[in-house]
């Protein structure tokens, strides 16, 4: 028998520097977590230990923090190589900053080598990229050789800016005939190493034939045999086991996100390449584990420039920008639009001529908007301004949910109205009536959504049967401020790029904003 | 030092089989893969395959799949290579060499060769 | 498969001179190329791995460059002794390994 150890994460987005606990920036360091001075020590330590160890990461490395914002993916690939990551899988934020954006800070100069077996350049991408991702990549370990096949979510195109010229494939089956010529070379263990979530990662272990094990990116899964260390609920076993068609049991892990979990993975094979037994946890990078001390000098090198960056000016406002709790848990206040309107621009993705976007809807909770900004300083809009109103490093996602569901959440809105409160929507692509004189649960009259399957956009009725596109923060994704409904009914949630940057690229963009309050949100006569 | 001992030429018949071996000395023979390379008269190189000693595990260049056999006999840290089915086209030196890697990023390079046989195939 | 092409079969130079031996990979290879030396009746000797990195024992006066698809070997003040023939091998492939056809240094 043959042992093999899979370090693996997934989902890291930007987290270089230790965390709190919940994935925000530290605050108390004796009670930090993660990082990549941290996880290089455990990793090392793991090295040192074992004999045939692999590190690998699933994607999404890019987006999260300011780190992101500076560096662009440069500081992807300076940590990574620095990690001696030995393969990872491209994830759909990896394509935020357009194909441009992956190529050159990344591709060029990871010393890894970064899969996707169903991403397929055409046109004059195709010889540029030519050989800078592979479909897979073959690695001796130890007295035996390793496949490891990439996938990445056939989504990106509606998550993130590939362009027109990536074509993305079913992960099936693009990942079969990889897998049957890594098996012509002999190769009889192969792991599949993808971005895709946990559905799309079973399936894959399920459907395609040849693959030993699953390490998968995308839906944040937490997995966890026994008692959990933190806060994290196991969504099942780790590792979770799936019978393939052909009868094998195929373990498949992912490490929940944000590098505060290494996964840790022992599989023993058999001499034909079959899997014998695998068995292990996700270490919790907690601070019993110490700071590498030369990977963290690097980072403090690294971090004079991000401190320089949240002072420059991005754009300016002539118009006070209303974040005050006084408005923005009562009323539409021009703060909240200003929010709603860069979640849309960020998510314009124009890949179907019969829409003008996939999406034209946005909400927020008033309570995720802790800062007004004043125009009167030369109307010059920071970083840190930002950072002021988004304190809370969330991201916007991309759900899918029933207008039935969008009903129950305006009416959650107001049914406690008054009491500043942070659950007050703020809008963008729709239009609320609210009657407050009537009782709670009943007091959405007019529910009007902006169309996307059109060339000139329009309100219309909500539709309580029709499925909706919505872009929101994180926080009211996961049921935040009592949006239990959002959490429980949405139909498909995939996570976005981080609040402070979907807003500051739209200020860079714009470089004057006057946003104002416009008749979004309105109360039925006489009863306000 | 490092030494890989190849056995000496062969005349062999159209149709033959014959057995190449390799004596490695000077090191861990368990502990690094052997690769077998071809070089026809005057022609460039050839990767064949490799083996590794300890696992027995092998890969082989597609083009080569039925014509070499590559095993290892760890008690006398030597290896062989059946060639099977013998044209003119076989006709060439055979080189097997040693094969390191690590470091970082992987680097992977033949670092150690046999002095070559030289196999023949003639009526 | 990848495919190493050595344009020139043939490079003349003279001794004391510098010569650039080209080796084009037909997609990214990364930096995953070595270079061989093929003397006359002996077998292959390591040059250079990771494209740049000179093997134990390899003078300074053999440079390797290069990235993605284009690489390099470079011979400073030729010496009689560097008559040869030089192969590039890529083994971004890895397990598949793929030489170039080689070019064979001549020395007026």
């Known amino acids: 028998a043959w042992e093999l150890t899979i370090l693996h994460t997934n989902d890291v987005h930007s987290r270089l520097e230790q965390t709190s606990e919940d994935s925000s920036k530290c605050v108390n360091a004796s009670r930090c977590m993660g990082g990549v001075a941290r996880l290089f020590t455990k990793v090392q330590q793991i090295r040192r230990a074992e004999p045939n160890v692999l590190l690998l990461d699933a994607g999404d490395q890019y987006q999260g923090t300011i780190w992101f914002t500076v560096y662009k993916g440069a500081e992807v690939a300076h940590f990574m190589n620095a990690l001696r990551y030995d393969a990872m899988a491209l994830g759909n934020h990896e394509f935020d900053n357009g194909v441009e954006g992956l190529i050159e800070p990344l591709l060029k100069e990871a010393k890894f080598p970064i899969l996707s077996a169903n991403i397929k350049a055409k046109g004059p991408l195709a010889s540029q990229i030519s050989g800078l991702y592979l479909p897979y990549k073959v690695l001796p370990v130890g007295d035996e050789v390793v496949g490891i096949v990439g996938y990445t979510s056939k989504e990106t195109p509606f998550l993130s800016n590939p362009g027109t010229n990536l074509v993305f494939e079913d992960e099936i089956t693009a990942l079969q005939p990889e897998v049957d010529k890594l098996k012509t070379l002999n190769v009889n263990k192969i792991i599949a190493l993808g971005h895709s979530g946990f559905e799309m990662d079973k399936l894959i272990a399920q459907k395609v034939r040849g693959v030993d094990v699953v390490v998968g990116g995308h839906s944040n899964t937490f997995l966890y045999t026994g008692n959990p260390p933190s806060k994290e609920v196991p969504a099942g076993k780790y590792p979770f086991i799936v019978t393939s068609d052909d009868g094998r049991k195929v373990p498949v892990v992912q490490a929940y996100a944000f590098g505060k979990y290494l996964g840790y993975l022992k599989i023993e094979f058999d001499e034909r390449g079959n899997v014998i037994s695998s068995h292990g946890n996700p270490i919790l990078l907690n601070s019993s584990i110490p700071e590498d001390p030369s990977i963290k000098a690097d980072i403090n090198k690294w971090r004079i420039k991000l401190d320089n960056y949240s002072t420059q000016e991005l754009g300016k406002t002539i118009v006070y920008l209303d974040g005050s709790s006084q408005s923005c848990r009562f009323r539409e206040c021009n703060m909240g639009n200003l929010i709603c309107d860069a979640m849309i621009n960020n998510n314009l993705r124009h890949t179907d001529e019969m829409f003008w976007n996939h999406v034209s809807m946005c909400i927020l909770n008033g309570g995720g908007i802790r800062s007004p900004i004043d125009e009167r300083n030369n109307g010059t809009i920071t970083w840190e301004n930002l950072a002021a109103v988004l304190p809370f490093g969330g991201t916007f996602d991309l759900v899918q949910l029933k207008g039935s569901t969008l009903k129950k959440a305006f009416e959650h809105s107001v049914h406690r109205y008054g009491q500043s409160t942070g659950e007050f929507l703020q809008v963008g692509g729709i239009h609320v009536v609210y009657d407050l004189s009537r009782k709670p649960g009943d007091r959405v009259v007019k529910l009007d959504v902006l169309c996307t399957k059109c060339r000139v956009p329009s309100y219309d009725p909500l539709k309580m049967d029709e499925v909706y596109k919505v872009i929101l923060p994180n926080f009211l994704a996961n049921g935040g401020d009592g949006f239990q409904m959002i959490k429980d009914e949405l139909l498909r949630h995939d996570s976005g790029d981080q609040d402070i940057n979907v807003v500051s690229t739209y200020i860079s963009k714009m470089k004057v904003i006057y946003p104002a309050v416009e008749g979004r949100i309105k109360f039925s006569t006489g009863s306000h | 030092q490092v030494q890989l001992q190849q056995s000496g030429a062969g005349l062999v018949k159209p149709g033959a089989s014959v057995k190449l071996s390799c004596k490695a000395s000077?090191?861990?023979?368990?502990?690094?893969?052997m690769h077998w390379v071809k070089q026809r008269p005057g022609q460039g190189l050839e990767w064949i395959g490799m083996?590794?000693?300890?696992?027995?595990?092998?890969n082989n260049n597609e083009k080569f799949k039925n014509k070499a056999t590559l095993t290892v006999d760890k008690s006398s840290n030597t290896a062989y290579m059946q060639l099977s089915s013998l044209t003119s086209e076989d006709s060439a030196v055979y080189y097997c060499?040693?094969?390191?890697?690590?470091?970082?990023?992987?680097?992977?390079?033949?670092?150690?060769w046999g002095q070559g046989t030289s196999v023949t195939v003639s009526s | 498969d990848i495919v190493m092409t050595q344009s020139q079969k043939f490079m003349s130079t003279t001794v004391g001179d510098r010569v650039s031996i080209t080796c084009k990979a037909s997609?990214?290879?990364?930096?995953?190329v070595a270079w061989y030396q093929q003397k006359p009746g002996q077998s292959p000797k390591l040059l250079i791995y990771?494209?740049?990195d000179r093997y134990t024992g390899v003078p300074d006066r053999l440079t390797g460059s290069g990235s993605g698809t284009d690489f390099t070997l470079t011979i400073s003040n030729v010496q009689s002794e560097d008559l040869a023939d030089y192969f590039c091998?890529?083994?971004?492939?890895?397990?598949?390994?793929?030489f170039g056809s080689g070019t064979k240094l001549v020395i007026q």
């Open positions: 000077g090191y861990t023979f368990t502990n690094y893969w």
């Open positions: 990771s494209a740049s």
């Open positions: 060499a040693r094969f390191f890697f690590g470091g970082y990023p992987h680097y992977y390079a033949l670092d150690y």
């Open positions: 997609q990214n290879v990364g930096t995953a």
């Open positions: 083996i590794h000693p300890n696992s027995g595990s092998t």
């Open positions: 091998q890529q083994y971004s492939s890895f397990p598949l390994f793929t």
